[in-house]
Structures are given as C-alpha cells and as structure tokens.
C-alpha cells in the first residue's frame, strides 16, 4: 500500500487516520528533503492532484482541509516542487478511512443445525460501519461459569464438542472498531432447545384420478428427532395468499400428505419444520411446483420441475436439485 513508500518527510491526519464519516478533516504534509526548500507542496488523493483548500503553514509544511469527508477509503500522498528538480519529489503517503462506530448488536440468535456439529450464532450488526469491525462472541456456562470468547468478523460456528460446560449458556456479542465499542444484551440458551431439524424437502407430487381427484405430496427429512412439527404452505401460482397445513410428524417414514385441489391449476408448495415445542424453524424449503390435471391425473417429481408429463394412470411432479448444507435462510 501507500504506507510502504520511502518518505522524505511526514504526512498526518487530524483528528486521526480513521475518523467518523462526514467529519471535517485536515491532512498535514511536512517536507524533509535534503537540499530542497520546497517552492510548492502538492496533495494527491487516489492519484489525483487536489487544487483547493490547501494552506501553506510554513516553509516546509502545508495543510489540506476537507469538509464533510464521505469516502470510506482514500490513498493520500504529498509531493514537493524543489528548485533545480525537474519532477515533483515524493514526500510521503498515507491510507485514510472513514466510517462509523458499531451499533449495539441485537437479535443475537444461536442454533444448532442437526448433524452440523456446530452451534451457529448470528446477530444483527446494524448499519454498515465501512471500517474493519470485529466481533467477540462470549459464551459463558451457567453451570461452571467458565467463559469462552470467539473473535470473528461476521457470524460464528462453535463446535458443540467445545461446549463442555453443560447445557445452559449465556451468549453475548461485543462489537468494536477504531471508532467505538458496543455490547449486546445477553441471550440465555439451552442446547437442547436450539436444535433445528435436518432440512425437509418435497420430493414428489401425484394427482390420483378418483371421484374427487386427490393430490399426494411426498416429503421427507433426514432428521432423527422424534417429535417434529411441520407446516406445509401451498397456493395457486396466481394467488398472493398461502394456505397452511400443520402436521405432527415422525420422519421414520417418508411423509405422504393429501390435498384436494382445483383442476388444471399450477400450485406451489413449501415445507418447514421445527422440533415440537421449540423456538426455531427451518427456512422454508425450495419452491415445488405441481400442475393439477384437467381430467388425466398427474405426477410431478424432483427431476422434472420444469416439465410435466402424462403417465397414463397418474401425472406426477418430481423436484430437482440437491440440498446444500448452507441452504438455511431465515430461522425466526
């Protein structure tokens, strides 16, 4: 960077190299060049010469003044015009940054995605700070009172193996940067209460031609949690409003749920689950589309989410795509 150049003098910033965005700042340049009494001192910002608000303080020093500085980062350097020198002589350079102190972190949330082996803690960091901001996540056992700290620049994954102090913890987050420090409220957690079951997916739909046509949705999860509550929402793609069906589910088996839908309409389905009685839900699963037949029954499944075909007795939809472990979305 610009800070690594060999200097023939000194450049400094008041009030500081990192300052609050929108402040008035002064950049000073002092020459110390052998056999040179500078005729003129020049300032450059990001390689472009500044023309205004430059004041000569004395023979070797000048000041550049900025009002309401709003750039997050800038590279500054200054040069001198020396007699008998054809080119300007570089004096020194400095990278400057402007931003904001951190907001108080809020909405601290910790969850354990089943099979992940981690407790994932997230929070709302508030407004963008524009400058390097670090977060320290404090995890304190309510049983042993032992406290662990984890440094991060965003969220944190804490191995559940490292949580040796029982099941109950306090979690809070400190945010800090060059302009300030803030601390969140404390969140009390019990490890058994924050598990989110392995993602549920809709794999297939089929409409069976009966006196009243009926659509069967096949859906599944790899969870081994015994008591799981799920919601399946569905609507015609032309509608704004979702219908929601609730299920108490045991994923020992693949689930099959029946719906009585209007004929010749394209529907969209999603599912999400939580451990029964617990706080956090999975994100909604990816959209699953199924068009009900006019008269001929229909099957839709994961591999054919863009095509619908007739199979004689039934017409089905099969959903496409693989689950990814980071397909998590909202958890509230």
């Amino acid at each position: 960077g610009i800070t690594n150049i060999n200097c023939s003098g000194h450049i400094w910033v008041e009030p500081a190299t990192i300052f609050k965005m929108g402040m008035n700042i002064s950049i000073y340049c002092q020459a110390a060049i052998k056999n040179c009494q500078p005729r003129k001192l020049h300032f450059y910002k990001n390689g472009i010469k500044e023309r205004f608000q430059i004041t000569r303080i004395n023979k070797t020093t000048a000041r550049l003044w900025y009002k309401n500085f709003l750039e997050p980062h800038a590279s500054m350097y200054c040069t001198a015009e020396c007699p008998k020198h054809f080119q300007e002589t570089l004096i020194c350079g400095k990278d400057i940054s402007s931003g904001y102190p951190p907001d108080i972190p809020d909405e601290v949330t910790c969850v354990i995605y089943e099979y992940s082996g981690n407790m994932t803690c997230t929070w709302n960091a508030g407004k963008l700070t524009y400058i390097d901001t670090k977060y320290v996540v404090h995890v304190k056992s309510l049983e042993t009172e032992e406290e662990q700290q984890y440094l991060t620049s965003s969220y944190i994954n804490i191995s559940t193996d490292s949580l040796q102090g029982g099941k109950k913890y306090l979690v809070w987050v400190q945010a800090a940067n060059a302009l300030g420090m803030e601390e969140s409220k404390q969140l009390q957690i019990h490890l058994d209460d924050i598990v989110i079951p392995s993602a549920a997916v809709i794999s297939r739909a089929e409409t069976i031609n009966a006196t009243v046509p009926k659509t069967i949705i096949y859906w599944d999860s790899q969870t081994t949690i015994e008591k799981v509550s799920c919601e399946m929402r569905y609507k015609a793609t032309t509608n704004q409003t979702w219908n929601v069906k609730e299920f108490d589910t045991n994923f020992t088996y693949v689930q099959q749920s029946e719906f009585y839908l209007e004929p010749n309409i394209k529907y969209v389905f999603q599912v999400r689950c939580q451990e029964t009685g617990k706080r956090y839900w999975q994100p909604w699963s990816s959209l699953f589309f199924h068009k009900t037949p006019e008269t001929v029954p229909q099957v839709t499944s994961k591999a054919f989410q863009h095509d619908t075909w007739n199979s004689g007795l039934t017409v089905a939809s099969i959903s496409t795509g693989h689950l990814t472990s980071d397909n998590r979305g909202d958890i509230g």
């Epitope: 997916v201 599944d220 088996y253 795509g321």
Partner: nanobody
Amino acid sequence: QVQLQESGGGSVQAGGSLRLSCTASGYTFSTMKYMGWFRQAPGKEREGVAAIWIAAGNTYYADSVKGRFTISQDNTKNTVYLQMNSLKPEDTALYYCAAARYGFVPSTWYLPERYNYWGQGTQVTVSS
C-alpha cells in the same frame, strides 16, 4: 412385495468402467428413504459402497471409491445406478442393491442393518 433387481455386472480390465443398475418394483419408489450399494468379496464382510437419499439426491460414498464411483437415481424408472470408473482389482466383489424404508442418522448409511430390502447381487470382476 418389494423386489430389487441388479444388472450391469461383468468382467473388466483394471482401469475400465461398468454401470450397475438397480430397478425396484412392488412399491412407490418415493416411499423409500435411502437406496444403497454394498459389496462382498469372498471371505470378507459386506461393506457399504455408496448410498443416496431419495428425496433430495444427497449422496454418500466409502472413502475407497470416492472420486471413482457415482451413485444416481432416476425416479421415473424406479432405478438407482452405480457408475464405476477407474476400476481396480480390489473392487472385485458381488455387488448388492439395498433399500431402506426407515430413517437413520445419515452418517451410518454404510451399515447393512439399516436396510430392509436387498437384491440378489451382481458379480463384478476386475482383472489386472
């Protein structure tokens, strides 16, 4: 009742490829949780080769076949495939297809006792 029929076995030179198929009948494919491929060499225990979670296509492999074998499914044909590339003499075995009706912890996919239904097997022989 549930029936699994393997095909595609045979003899091949080391470095060659084979594609095994397992076609299921007697049930709706989508009601199975997992399908897996196992193998048993003479005098050895049956070992898990690969498995697939039917609902979303998540796949699992034994370390010894990772990067060489690929398991896939075709729900429209009620079929699971095992594409075997870069075959080695140590891949010689009787290959079985299996289906699991009930859920289990995914990391235990390779345990034969997790599976309820089995095919008769198809022989794969790799010569050096």
